[in-house]
Interface confidence: medium
């Protein structure tokens, strides 16, 4: 019940106060549990305790394991344990589900992220905020004390968001970040029956022989969270994959979009080295979700080759 | 997910899974997760069919409510092999029906402890 699980980076100071909580005035003192070695209190130490905080200043891989404090007060003792990992740092953008901090929700009307831990440290403005490690920029992003503030969030809001300050300890800066996802609350999600917005009912395309041709089967479903929702091409009333033909195959575009906060979904099918034959075959785009199935057909008629002038 | 329990055998539980956040998910099922056992596929609902492991056909339903984002697992005529560890999945991607690596989107998992 008095554990509590803190992670780092290696390189960025970590701060980890107990999780047993006393008076001020009580005093603190830690222990690294594995060899019930006592920490010092030190300020030239790296890692060092200073009452209910633990510093890594910075932290190590080598450092993790598990820390004890005792919260000592005149009457009493208090026990409490802080599991501390220290991870290497990623090479790449992706932030792992172990460095990453508790989701938050957010709507048009609260958009605040709060820069996890932040209250431990002894960090000046500014805080740096990145977004699936893109530098946020523009209007919408405003750095408030220890939060971001989104202006009208919208759909595409939603993701990963890091935030980065300096912490300052006895003149000396040490580099922190914290990542937590942020999920877009939908205030009036909805779901309708499937619309199709391409191709159009009854299109016919102009391919030509020998050459490859695309059919993209674009449809929306509503608005926010769509439950179950697919788009698929079928030839002459067959699945693509049952259908056997290897030079037609679909594949997703861009699997979900929400422009205009509405979700859709595009599959297209690639038909390589058109032949006579695909001429003759009926081309059924479906949309389906469970308010029902709609179907747009497209016919393919060969492209009169352009006539030269000479 | 929630709904899992304690129950004995032929007893019934209803497990219940909320979708959330911005997604379009193609299908969703339920997986399960006996110890020391692989995670298997349990049921499978897309937008137009349900499919269920021939361990459970005719004693688990698989339904949906799209108004709540919500899927439901009923559980009927339990058996002590039915016990693990039940994980509702989304799909957004195409892929294999019955395949735990073609879901993208997994819940905490509820646990489901039939006795005899």
């Known amino acids: 019940k008095f554990s509590k699980q803190s992670w780092g980076l290696e390189n960025e100071a970590l701060i980890v106060r107990c999780p047993r909580q006393g008076k001020p005035s009580y005093t603190v003192d830690w222990y690294y549990s594995q060899t019930n070695k006592s920490i010092p209190t030190q300020e030239r130490n790296r890692v060092f305790a200073s009452g209910q905080l633990l510093k890594f200043l910075p932290a190590a891989v080598a450092d993790s394991g598990i820390y004890t404090c005792i919260v000592r007060s005149p009457t009493f003792n208090r026990t409490g344990y802080a599991n501390v990992t220290i991870y290497k740092k990623q090479s790449d953008c992706n932030v792992p589900d172990y460095l990453m901090y508790s989701t938050v929700s957010g709507s048009e009307k609260n958009s605040k992220i709060y820069c996890p831990t932040i209250d431990l440290y002894n960090w000046t403005a500014p805080l740096e905020w990145f977004k699936n490690c893109q530098a946020l920029q523009g209007s919408r992003y405003r750095a408030h004390k220890s939060f971001l503030v989104i202006d009208n969030v919208m759909t595409e809001d939603a993701g990963d968001y890091t935030c980065k300050f300096i912490h300052n300890e006895n003149g000396a800066n040490y580099s922190v970040t914290a990542t937590r996802s942020f999920t877009v609350k939908d205030e009036q999600g909805f779901s309708l029956f499937p619309v199709i917005g391409a191709p159009a009912q009854n299109e016919i395309k102009e391919v030509e022989i020998g050459k490859n041709a695309n059919l993209t089967c674009s449809a929306c479903f509503g608005k926010g969270t769509q439950f179950l929702a697919a788009v698929l091409w079928q030839l002459n009333g067959t699945k693509i994959t049952d259908f056997g033909e290897p030079r037609i195959q679909q594949e997703e575009g861009q699997n979900q979009s929400f422009s205009n906060g509405l979700a859709c979904l595009d599959m297209v099918l690639r038909i390589a080295d058109v032949k006579e034959e695909d001429l003759l075959l009926q081309y059924d785009c479906l949309a389906l979700n469970l308010h029902g199935l709609r179907r747009h057909t497209v016919r393919l008629s060969r492209k009169n080759p352009s006539k030269e002038c000479f | 997910e929630s709904g899992g329990g304690s129950v004995q055998a032929g007893g019934s539980l209803r497990l219940s899974c909320a979708a959330s956040g911005y997604t379009i998910n193609y299908r969703m099922g339920w997986f399960r997760q006996a110890p020391g056992k692989e995670r298997e596929g349990v049921a499978m609902?897309?937008?137009?069919?349900?499919d269920y492991a021939d361990s459970v056909k005719g004693r688990f339903s698989i339904s949906r409510d799209s108004a709540k984002n919500t899927l439901y697992l009923q559980m009927n005529s339990l058996k002590p092999e039915d016990t693990g560890m039940y994980y509702c999945?989304?799909?957004?991607?195409?892929?294999?029906?019955?395949?735990?690596?073609?879901?993208?989107?997994w819940g905490q998992g509820t646990q489901v402890t039939v006795s005899s």
């Open positions: 609902a897309s937008a137009i069919s349900e």
């Open positions: 999945a989304a799909g957004r991607v195409w892929g294999r029906l019955w395949n735990p690596d073609d879901y993208n989107s």
